[in-house]
């Protein structure tokens, strides 16, 4: 029974995983892998940390939070449908059979062709200006009247990033968290 997380194609996906270090800087090795957690380590490792730093990573996978404070949540950049599946976060706490493992299910949805109303509201809340658009010639390139130097692609990306950051904060409360020591 994995906890399920969602993202759209082209977005950054966020998979939460946390622990509380016994003391500041007293880090615990962590691995992230694609596929359910096996008995040992992670299968198909995409990122790994030791007691000091990230010591192995692959492209598009990174730790956006402060892993030195125990935030080992995984960010997957620019996801595709192939990124769907189970991911394993394993916190390798020293001792006999002490490590904690969490299976998180990532569901990737196709990108929406047109922005949903909720996304428009999100952006309006972040930028409370009149969002009128005007066409420019046959190509119908659309820009915001009040922000003439920002195109819709940039706005959509910005809106996604804003939403991602809010989502990250929301998920922090529901993510896998353990306390050590």
């Amino acid at each position: 029974s994995e906890v399920e997380y969602r993202a759209e194609v082209g977005q950054n996906a966020y998979l939460p995983c946390f622990y509380t270090p016994a003391a500041p800087g007293n880090l615990v090795p962590v691995c992230w892998g694609k596929g359910a957690c096996p008995v040992f380590e992670c299968g198909n490792v995409v990122l790994r940390t030791d007691e000091r730093d990230v010591n192995y990573w692959t492209s598009r996978y990174w730790l956006n939070g402060d892993f030195r404070k125990g935030d080992v949540s995984l960010t997957i950049e620019n996801v595709t449908l192939a990124d769907s599946g189970i991911y394993c976060c394993r916190i390798q706490i020293p001792g006999i059979m002490n490590d904690e493992k969490f299976n998180l299910k990532l569901v990737i949805k196709p990108a929406k062709v047109t922005p949903a109303p909720t996304r428009q509201r999100d952006f309006t809340a972040a930028f409370p200006r009149m969002l009128t658009t005007r066409g420019h010639g046959p190509a119908e390139t659309q820009t915001l009247g009040s922000l003439p130097d920002i195109n819709l692609t940039q706005i959509s990306t910005l809106a996604n990033e804003l939403r991602d950051s809010r989502l990250a904060n929301d998920l922090r409360d529901s993510g896998a968290t353990i306390r050590i020591g």
Epitope: P29, G35, A36, V39, G95, N98
Partner: antibody, heavy 125, light 108 residues
């Protein structure tokens, strides 16, 4: 070339102790988890213990044991000396076997990809 | 714990014949964590197949692996003398990791 060489086996009385060693070379030992697996004469393979990489200090390792050896065997490692250990106490006749150390590959195979040649342990009075 | 049952325990095959060894699990095993090892008398085991169907380095292409859930198999498309050995399946999907009892494959 990856090499694992076990030593320390021999004949021991029931209730006795023995410490096995596994010297590793040809790879960054501190970066890999390690296993001990045994094989009784003419029998199958029996996993007994695992220790995670503990890449900076051996005290940082996560350890797993088979129920059959829990409380009697202790797995440890010395990353500075590229050596894996298995301290065996309260030995029983059923512990008689060839003992192998094996590397746990996490980079692609997720398996015990290299094994030593083994060291023989005989528990008999 | 997951019990892996291999069959047959012993079998012999003529050169050129197709051989299939089976490994049955008492409960479901993730195909990513199902392996086969080859062992010859007096030698240590060698990783032969990993993640159900991937051949380890140096393993001849006549070998293949397949399966899912509780049923797995190793197949040799055309038996050769050097294939005579014991083959063990192994799972590390759930604790404790376990091995099958092995199949001893002999050449006729």
């Amino acid at each position: 070339e990856v090499q694992l060489v076990e030593s320390g086996g021999g004949l021991v009385r029931p209730g006795g102790s023995l410490k096995l060693s596994c010297a590793a070379s040809g790879f960054t030992f501190s970066d890999y988890g390690m296993h001990w697996v045994r094989q009784a004469p003419e029998k199958g393979l029996d996993w007994i213990a695992y220790i995670s990489s503990g890449s900076i200090s051996s005290g940082s390792s996560t350890i797993y044991y088979a129920d059959t050896v829990k409380g009697r065997f202790t797995i440890s490692r010395d990353n500075a000396k590229n050596t894996l250990f298995l301290q065996m106490t309260s030995l029983r006749s059923e512990d008689t076997a060839m003992y192998y150390c094996a590397r746990h590959d996490w980079r692609g195979l997720y398996a015990m990809d290299y094994w030593g040649q083994g060291t023989s342990v005989t528990v008999s009075s | 714990q997951i019990v892996l049952t291999q069959s047959p325990a012993i079998m012999s095959a003529s050169p050129g014949k197709k051989v299939t060894l089976t490994c049955s699990a008492s409960s479901s095993v993730s195909s990513s964590y199902l392996y086969w090892y080859q062992q010859k008398p007096g030698s240590s085991p060698k990783l032969w197949i990993y993640s159900t169907s991937n051949l380890a380095s140096g393993v001849p292409a006549r070998f293949s692996g397949s399966g899912s859930g509780t049923s797995y198999s190793l197949t040799i498309s055309s038996m050769e003398a050097e294939d005579a050995a014991s083959y063990f399946c192994h799972q590390s999907s759930s604790y404790p990791p376990t091995f099958g009892g092995g199949t001893k494959l002999e050449i006729k």
